[in-house]
C-alpha cells in the first residue's frame, strides 16, 4: 500500500512538474499586420485564441518573455502570399524572410537567433504565389528574456492561424 | 495638398504620337505608383498601365501594350504617359491617378485611386 | 479576366430618395471593389474602397456593402450635388457606369 502511495505521489509529481512546463504557440494577429517593404517587427499575436495557446511564460509588446530559465526548442513558421485580386507586385523580384530574435534587458543586447528565406521571383503572369519558411532551434533561455519576429514585405504575409505562428517549450532545466 | 496637374489638350493625325504629363504635389512622388486611365465618349473607364515612381517599373493593360510608354521624371515629380500609332478610337479624356498604397507601407499596388489628374482630352482626327 | 457589370446604366430619383447601385464580378474578388464619382470636366473622386470603406472627405450618405461577386452603392438621401456618373473598379476593370439623374 505504502508504494501504491508513493508512485500515485511521484506521478502526480511529474505531472505537475510537465504541467508546469513552458510553452506558447502564438498565431499572428491578422488585423494588426504592419507595413512596410523592409524588415519590420511582427507585435500582434494572438496567445489564447484558436490554435494559439500560453503557459508560464509570457506575451507582452509584441515579445515572448520566458519565465524559467532552461532549454527551449524554438519554431517559427512564415507563409508569404500574394493574390492577383489584391493588385499587382510593385516589384517582382522579392527578399521573402524571417529573423527569430533574443532580446536581453539585463545586458542590454539583441541577437539574431535563426533567419530563414529566399530571394523570389514573383512574376506578375502569374495568378498566385506562395512561399513558406519554417525555422527551430534548441536554445538556452534566461527567465525576462524575450523572443520577436521580424520579417521582410509584411503586406504579403498569409493572415491564417495555420500559416504565420511561433511558438516555444522548454524541454530541460538549465542543470 | 495632394494634387496632380495634367498638361492641356491635344489634337493629332491618325499615325501620330501624344504625349502626356502629370506634375504631383503635396506628397512623396517616390513612395506611390501613377495609373493612367482614359474614357472615350460614351465609353467606360479603361486602365491603361501603372508606374511604379521609385523604382520605375511598369505595367500595361494587353490591349496597348507595344505602343505605350510611360516614364517619370522624380526630380520633377513629374510622370509621362505617351501613346503613339493614334487612330480615331483613341479620342478620349486621359487621366493619371495616383495608386493609394504607398510603396513605403508594403509593396502591393492596390488600385485605389485616391488622387485624379483634372484629364487631357486628346482628339485624334485627320 | 474579369468583368464588372454595373445596374441600372441610368437612374432617376427625387433629393431625399434612397438610391441604390449594384456592381457584378463575374467571378469572386473578396472586398477588392472601388467606387467612384465623375462629374463632366472634373476629376474623377474615390468615395468607397475596399467595398465598404468611406474615403476621406466623402459624405456619410454614401456607403458600400457586400463580398465575393455581388456588391452595392447606396446613397442614403439623394443631393443635387450627387448628380454624376458612378463607376464600379476592381483592379484593372471598371464596371460600365451608371448615371443618376434628378427628377
Known amino acids: 500500500e505504502k508504494a501504491m502511495v508513493d508512485g500515485s505521489w511521484l506521478d502526480l509529481a511529474k505531472r505537475s512538474k510537465l504541467e508546469a512546463q513552458p510553452f506558447a504557440h502564438l498565431t499572428i494577429n491578422a488585423t494588426d499586420i504592419p507595413s512596410g517593404s523592409h524588415k519590420v517587427s511582427l507585435s500582434s499575436w494572438y496567445h489564447d485564441r484558436g490554435w494559439a495557446k500560453i503557459s508560464n511564460m509570457t506575451f507582452s509588446n509584441g515579445k515572448l518573455i520566458v519565465n524559467q530559465d532552461g532549454f527551449y526548442y524554438l519554431y517559427a513558421n512564415i507563409c508569404f502570399r500574394h493574390h492577383e485580386t489584391s493588385g499587382d507586385l510593385a516589384t517582382e523580384y522579392l527578399q521573402l524572410m524571417v529573423y527569430v530574435t533574443k532580446t536581453s534587458i539585463k545586458i542590454p543586447s539583441s541577437h539574431t537567433l535563426m533567419k530563414g528565406g529566399s530571394t523570389k521571383y514573383w512574376s506578375g503572369n502569374s495568378e498566385f504565389h506562395f512561399y513558406s519558411i519554417n525555422v527551430g532551434g534548441f536554445f538556452k533561455l534566461r527567465s525576462g528574456e524575450e523572443i520577436s519576429i521580424e520579417v521582410s514585405n509584411p503586406s504579403l504575409l498569409d493572415p491564417d492561424q495555420d500559416a504565420t505562428y511561433f511558438g516555444a517549450f522548454k524541454v530541460r532545466d538549465i542543470d | 495638398q495632394v494634387q496632380l496637374v495634367q498638361s492641356g489638350a491635344e489634337v493629332r493625325k491618325p499615325g501620330a504620337s501624344v504625349k502626356v504629363s502629370c506634375k504631383a504635389s503635396?506628397?512623396?512622388?517616390?513612395?506611390?505608383?501613377i495609373h493612367w486611365v482614359r474614357q472615350a465618349p460614351g465609353q467606360r473607364l479603361e486602365w491603361m498601365g501603372w508606374i511604379n515612381a521609385g523604382n520605375g517599373n511598369t505595367k500595361f493593360s494587353q490591349k496597348f501594350q507595344g505602343r505605350i510608354t510611360v516614364t517619370r521624371d522624380t526630380a520633377a515629380s513629374t510622370a509621362y504617359m505617351e501613346l503613339r500609332s493614334l487612330r480615331s478610337e483613341d479620342t478620349a479624356v486621359y487621366y493619371c491617378?495616383?495608386?493609394?498604397?504607398?510603396?513605403?507601407?508594403?509593396?502591393?499596388?492596390?488600385?485605389?485611386?485616391?488622387?485624379w489628374g483634372q484629364g487631357t482630352l486628346v482628339t485624334v482626327s485627320s | 479576366e474579369i468583368v464588372m457589370t454595373q445596374s441600372p446604366s441610368s437612374l432617376s430619383a427625387s433629393v431625399g430618395d434612397r438610391v441604390t447601385i449594384t456592381c457584378r464580378a463575374s467571378q469572386s474578388i473578396s472586398r477588392y471593389l472601388n467606387w467612384y464619382q465623375l462629374k463632366p470636366g472634373k476629376a474623377p473622386r474615390l468615395l468607397i474602397y475596399?467595398?465598404?470603406s468611406l474615403q476621406s472627405g466623402v459624405p456619410s450618405r454614401f456607403s458600400g456593402s457586400g463580398s465575393g461577386a455581388e456588391f452595392t452603392l447606396t446613397i442614403s438621401s439623394l443631393q443635387p450635388e450627387d448628380i454624376a456618373t458612378y463607376y464600379c473598379q476592381h483592379t484593372r476593370a471598371f464596371g460600365q457606369g451608371t448615371k443618376v439623374e434628378i427628377k
Open positions: 503635396g506628397y512623396d512622388f517616390s513612395n506611390y505608383a
Open positions: 491617378a495616383r495608386d493609394s498604397s504607398a510603396m513605403v507601407r508594403g509593396i502591393i499596388i492596390a488600385y485605389y485611386f485616391d488622387y
Open positions: 475596399g467595398a465598404s
